[in-house]
Amino acid sequence: SGVFQLQLQEFINERGVLASGRPCEPGCRTFFRVCLKHFQAVVSPGPCTFGTVSTPVLGTNSFAVRDDSSGGGRNPLQLPFNFTWPGTFSLIIEAWHAPGDDLRPEALPPDALISKIAIQGSLAVGQNWLLDEQTSTLTRLRYSYRVICSDNYYGDNCSRLCKKRNDHFGHYVCQPDGNLSCLPGWTGEYCQQPICLSGCHEQNGYCSKPAECLCRPGWQGRLCNECIPHNGCRHGTCSTPWQCTCDEGWGGLFCDQDLNYCTHHSPCKNGATCSNSGQRSYTCTCRPGYTGVDCELELSECDSNPCRNGGSCKDQEDGYHCLCPPGYYGLHCEHSTLSCADSPCFNGGSCRERNQGANYACECPPNFTGSNCEKKVDRCTSNPCANGGQCLNRGPSRMCRCRPGFTGTYCELHVSDCARNPCAHGGTCHDLENGLMCTCPAGFSGRRCEVRTSIDACASSPCFNRATCYTDLSTDTFVCNCPYGFVGSRCEFPVGLPPSFPW
């Protein structure tokens, strides 16, 4: 679809005569009839196949024609066509004399003709005007013409329809050749596909408008490249949605069971060494000078009776000092100036000479110790009881009195509430400091997983279009992870499909 435009510029009829040679009375009141038709090598009688148009009376005899496109569009003359422009044409321009006001063909005789011209040839669609001048015996006509496409038509033949739009069916303007030029932020054959935020994950993200990144179920983050872990996952991560892969030191379905109490809570004080000994249990190995379950108690250095041979111990800021009895010397009064001749061994200890009599050693009877058998044996000195157990001397032996929750000779064993398998229906048992907790499998609840609640939410295959179904164990619901190209809680809606166009 396009328009053949003809701009009449000047008509000269100096003698004011008709084609017959007769003069017009009083002058030739001139109007024009224009006929546009298919190309004819020789213009012959026949219809104006591309259209006709007439002007009002434009002047008398000789006159210039005003460009009247602003005020009603009479000049240039418009010859619209609604077909593919063939590139060739025949144009006939007739000048007629109008004796009266009635310009209808049937109101004028054929000999009211002043003159006529015919041109034929090739004409390409374009904005440039072609200027021409035709002279006959008595008249001269100057005019220009061109062919342009109608609004929304493009291409060499005005055959490509393109209407700019910015709606659901497309977001584009039209190039001079009729091809679409997408508006910023849009792509695709009909510019219907938004260009998502740069970096938005191709599979896990989508958008309904440019520079947006909406996440599909199971994904999060600005670029939808972070998976959403299982609901309730405490100390875990995921590589695909709804996973809960525990961080180091954590266990259980929700990664909420502390397998590394030492690292996470640092319970041992005063530089003690912490050893994990089960879920939420640990043992602190104290540095010298400290005691207690968490080595929180500072021992007096004299408590370990470091002074031998009856030496008395004095606490000092930076340690202790032994005051030795007569006949002894050394840091711990361990060196004697006595010999067996001095009968240094108490409590029935027998003396043995050493170093050719320069020294001696006492061999103590049971229940006595010390370099001179001067000390009654305290079997609790080495603090053998673990986990805060209390050591008790019982004559020649010792025993540990354990704190609740611990057992064994040295209170080294944790009494497990889970040992009797209290969780029903395959529930997982978790020992707590003051009791236990059951984590129930899907379909069961209650303190001991004894109550049947629901079936697997994914069992009914609720997801469409080959989506992956995940059961949310905490809510007994399902979540569909959609494949690319589908959205909706069940992945039931396709996205971004181009519509059919009517043209």
Epitope: C35, V43, S44, P45, G46, P47, P110, K116
Partner: antibody, heavy 124, light 113 residues
Framework: EVQLVQSGAEVKKPGASVKVSCKAS????????ISWVRQAPGQGLEWMGW????????NYAQKLQGRVTMTTETSTTTAYMELRSLRSDDTAVYYC?????????????????WGQGTTVTVSS | DIVMTQSPDSLAVSLGERATINCKSS????????????LAWYQQKPGQPPKLLIY???TRKSGVPDRFSGSGSGTDFTLTISSLQAEDVAVYYC?????????FGQGTKVDIK
Amino acid sequence: EVQLVQSGAEVKKPGASVKVSCKASGYTFNIYGISWVRQAPGQGLEWMGWISAYNGNTNYAQKLQGRVTMTTETSTTTAYMELRSLRSDDTAVYYCARDSDWGTPYHYYGMDVWGQGTTVTVSS
Amino acid sequence: DIVMTQSPDSLAVSLGERATINCKSSQNILYTSNNKNYLAWYQQKPGQPPKLLIYWAFTRKSGVPDRFSGSGSGTDFTLTISSLQAEDVAVYYCQQYYNTPRTFGQGTKVDIK
């Protein structure tokens, strides 16, 4: 009175040429066209071609292309039709008729005025 | 080229009776710009040139008796002689002048029965 007067009968040998004239009067000659029509004995009407008296544009029937020439003489308001390489099947009555000229087709009335006809006989 | 086909080829009608001749064109000869059909009807009596009766398919040329009428549009046309007279015995031709080459129908001979 509008009339067309044609030249007289012709007898020609095969291979010869004939030129028939048609003198127009009573109207403005150069704003119309002239069509030539022939009628073989006992047959219907056959259009031969058309000429514009305005500028001499011509349009010939396909079967006569190359053998026929139509001309006009504005000063004498006369049209001519010449047919060359005559054959026996060219024997016919040849008519000129006033016709529309090229242009906007608002004054097309058909062939409203006819000449009396010129008999051309082609015989060896 | 536009082909014109007349029917019947010949027709015998009693004096005072109606005669109807049909003409069909191979393509549309209605010009939509002025809503006119470019069809003429001619009458040819023996030894005479054809005479224009009707143009624009139904406009009678001045001087033609009103018993002659034309009708039709597009591709199908009719010439009707409402009350046949003795002087109407002739051959009748339809012709399109929509385009060149001009083309005639083969003619319909009208006689008195």
